[in-house]
Interface confidence: low
């Protein structure tokens, strides 16, 4: 049986005659053999399989719509041409085979004639008869093969017709699809126009909104500058007021001195000797004792150093002389600061600020200080906690807070955990919690785990100040979820 296969886009037909190595290689591909035996020689036809005779090109790809006919039609034509070639080859090979057999017969006959003895004539005739029979048999078989090839050709022609029909069908489908696509494109362009029109509309709307926004921004910036000017005027007025008060105080002192001088004019004292004024002050108590009894910002000098720091002094509350170390009042300053910032201080002494742990530590280790914490809620109530002994450890000990002797109206129990804890910030976690209290509750504070207070928490405005776990908290006065309106922490020597 003859069989045919396509390798990629061509059909290879192999004829092998008594070449063992060639046959081995073809056997390994697993193709069928057709064998003709002739004496000691055998003739083997190795032909590939008909079932696999398919084009290896990809089936009907997407861009095939652009072609005149589908790919399968081209394949059929190509295959038909190949089959015709094969037919021609087969005919030629059959003729060659006949000639070859006849040649062999002639050679054998000559050999027999040369070598035969008369008594072997009968054997020779028998051999000759056998050869003729075999030739006739092979010719018959070859005729069968030819008939089969013709059958295959007829079958392929039928397939080709079928393919032509399916091609026509496909072409019709493609035409339908093309018209559908055209319809969709029309719809699409209509929608695109609509979208573009809407976009134009939106751009116009956005521009008008932007213009409104710009106008608002101009208004806001104008208001801000007005507010800033007013603030500056207020500051100037406060300073002027402080200056006037100081001048008045100095005048009164001068008048008193003059009166004293007049009353003691007969004494031997030199009237030009005045009390030498202290130039540097360690805290607001010293400022107060030097005669400056007006609230305001004063320059303090660090103990045993020439370094200066500006602090707000409260010269009125509870006898005056208070150094303000913390103030919260309006949320204008961010208290979620680093260890370093809490160490050196930040903010504005006339507003919200933190004086600085290092200064407070050094100061409170020089002598005994009291700490007063003044609190305001959003309902107009005020309270305080007073600790009769307060100091901070050094930075090496994380500015640990030490407190003794609580009195006051902001709770019978200390809202700063006892014994005192180390100071913690967002970048310096020294609390007793697995969590990071400073990051969770915000602000630097002497957190426990995390403890009943945090006066450096988030500032929440009125009506947003309840149920806030990370607000400005003083538990034993207002509970855990209440965020206070204002706080002031102030220190003063115990012997003031």
């Amino acid at each position: 049986m003859w069989q045919i296969v396509f390798f990629t886009l061509s059909c290879d037909l192999v004829l092998a005659a008594a070449y063992n190595n060639f046959r081995k290689s073809m056997d390994s591909i697993g193709k069928k053999q057709y064998q003709v035996q002739h004496g000691s020689c055998s003739y083997t036809f190795l032909l590939p399989e008909m079932d696999n005779c398919r084009s290896s090109s990809s089936p009907y790809v997407s861009n095939a719509v652009q072609r005149d006919a589908p790919l399968e039609y081209d394949d059929s034509v190509q295959r038909l041409q190949v089959l015709e070639n094969i037919m021609e080859n087969n005919t030629q090979w059959l003729m060659k085979l006949e000639n070859y057999i006849q040649d062999n017969m002639k050679k054998e006959m000559v050999e027999i004639q040369q070598n035969a003895v008369q008594n072997q004539t009968a054997v020779m005739i028998e051999i000759g008869t056998n050869l003729l029979n075999q030739t006739a048999e092979q010719t018959r078989k070859l005729t069968d093969v030819e008939a089969q090839v013709l059958n295959q050709t007829t079958r392929l022609e039928l397939q080709l017709l079928e393919h032509s029909l399916s091609t026509n069908k496909l072409e019709k489908q493609i035409l339908d699809q093309t018209s559908e696509i055209n319809k969709l494109q029309d719809k699409n362009s209509f929608l695109e126009k609509k979208v573009l029109a809407m976009e134009d509309k939106h751009i116009i709307q956005l521009q008008s909104i932007k213009e409104e926004k710009d106008q608002l921004q101009v208004l806001v910036s104008k208001q801000n500058s007005i507010i800033e000017e007013l603030e500056k005027k207020i500051v100037t007025a406060t300073v002027n007021n402080s200056v006037l008060q100081k001048q008045q105080h100095d005048l009164m002192e001068t008048v008193n001195n003059l009166l004293t001088m007049m009353s003691t004019s007969n004494s031997a004292k030199d009237p030009t000797v005045a009390k030498e004024e202290q130039i540097s002050f360690r805290d607001c108590a010293e400022v107060f004792k030097s005669g400056h009894t007006t609230n305001g910002i004063y320059t303090l000098t660090f103990p045993n150093s020439t370094e200066e720091i500006k602090a707000y002094c409260d010269m009125e509350a509870g006898g005056g002389g208070w150094t303000i170390i913390q103030r919260r009042e309006d949320g204008s300053v961010d208290f979620q600061r680093t260890w370093k910032e809490y160490k050196v201080g930040f903010g504005n002494p006339s507003g919200e600020y933190w004086l600085g742990n290092e200064f407070v530590s050094q100061l409170t280790n020089q002598q005994r200080y009291v700490l007063k914490i003044h609190l305001k809620d959003w309902e107009g109530n005020e309270a305080y906690s007073l600790y009769e002994h307060f100091y901070l450890s050094s930075e090496e000990l994380n500015y640990r807070i030490h407190l003794k002797g609580l009195t006051g109206t902001a709770g019978k129990i200390s809202s700063i955990s006892q014994p005192g804890n180390d100071f913690s910030t967002k970048d310096g976690d020294n609390d007793k919690c697995i969590c990071k209290c400073s990051q969770m509750l915000t602000g630097g504070w002497w957190f426990d785990a995390c403890g009943p207070s945090n006066l450096n928490g988030m500032y929440y405005p009125q009506r947003q100040n309840t149920n806030k776990f990370n607000g400005i908290k003083w538990y034993y006065w207002k509970g855990s979820g209440y965020s206070l309106k204002a706080t002031t922490m102030m220190i003063r020597p115990a012997d003031f």
Epitope: F302, S305, E307, E308, I309, D334, W339, K340, V344, G345, F346, G347, N348, G356, E358, F359, E395, E396, D427, G428
Partner: antibody, heavy 119, light 106 residues
Framework: QVQLVQSGAEVKKPGASVKVSCKAS????????LHWVRQAPGQRLEWMGW????????SYAQKFKDRVTITRDTSASTAYMELSSLRSEDTAVYYC????????????WGQGTLVTVSS | DIQMTQSPSSLSASVGDRVTITCKAS??????LAWYQQKPGKVPKLLIY???SLQTGVPSRFSGSGSGTDFTLTISSLQPEDVATYYC????????FGGGTKVEIK
């Protein structure tokens, strides 16, 4: 008097690291924060980060966070700044600067170290 | 991050002239602003801190003013030795330098 003495100029290839030192003298090393500031040719000064005097805490500018490491050796009163994955745009003069005790500005500066990054 | 905008970027004035350099912060820095002078190939030198405080040893012709977001450095009478680039530095929230102002003599 207060002095900050930096290590000499360096030439590095892109992708390499550089480590610049800053030796402090004339003051108590553990009393002041030390900062690193750089200045590329013809550019503004640019703050890179600081190191705490006592516990060695560090903080870096967002821009350099992933590439800079500031360390210190208190016994040698020396701070170090290491910048990794160098690029040509890191070519600059690198300064160490001391922060005031109670003030946040820089009161003393090192003489600067020129780092050139070139292939 | 706070941005610092310095103006002008350069100026040329005669000896004895009054020179003014401004620095604008993108947000309120209260009074935490310093001015530095940097001569070519030299280290920055502190002139003014806390917006208006004159650093010890700095000539009194240098003065600073302003608060919040707008600050000014003034050289009352420009001298040849004042030729340099001047930088502002805000230190209220981290540290940011201005772009610098190059001062030259006409």
């Amino acid at each position: 008097q207060v002095q900050l003495v930096q290590s000499g100029a360096e030439v590095k290839k892109p992708g390499a690291s550089v480590k610049v030192s800053c030796k402090a003298s004339g003051y108590t090393f553990t009393n002041h924060y030390l900062h690193w500031v750089r200045q590329a040719p013809g550019q503004r000064l640019e703050w890179m980060g600081w190191i705490g005097p006592t516990n060695g805490d560090t903080s870096y500018a967002q821009k350099f966070k992933d590439r800079v490491t500031i360390t210190r050796d208190t016994s040698a009163s020396t701070a170090y700044m290491e910048l990794s994955s160098l690029r040509s745009e890191d070519t600059a003069v690198y300064y160490c600067a001391r922060e005031g005790y109670f003030t946040n500005y820089f009161d003393y500066w090192g003489q600067g170290t020129l780092v050139t990054v070139s292939s | 991050d706070i941005q610092m905008t310095q103006s002008p970027s350069s100026l040329s004035a005669s000896v004895g002239d009054r020179v003014t350099i401004t620095c604008k912060a993108s947000q309120n820095v209260i009074k935490y602003l310093a001015w530095y002078q940097q001569k070519p190939g030299k280290v920055p030198k502190l002139l003014i801190y806390n917006a208006s405080s004159l650093q010890t040893g700095v000539p009194s012709r240098f003065s600073g003013s302003g608060s919040g977001t707008d600050f000014t450095l003034t050289i009352s009478s420009l001298q040849p030795e004042d030729v340099a680039t001047y930088y502002c530095l805000q230190y209220n929230s981290w540290w940011t330098f201005g772009g610098g102002t190059k001062v030259e003599i006409k």
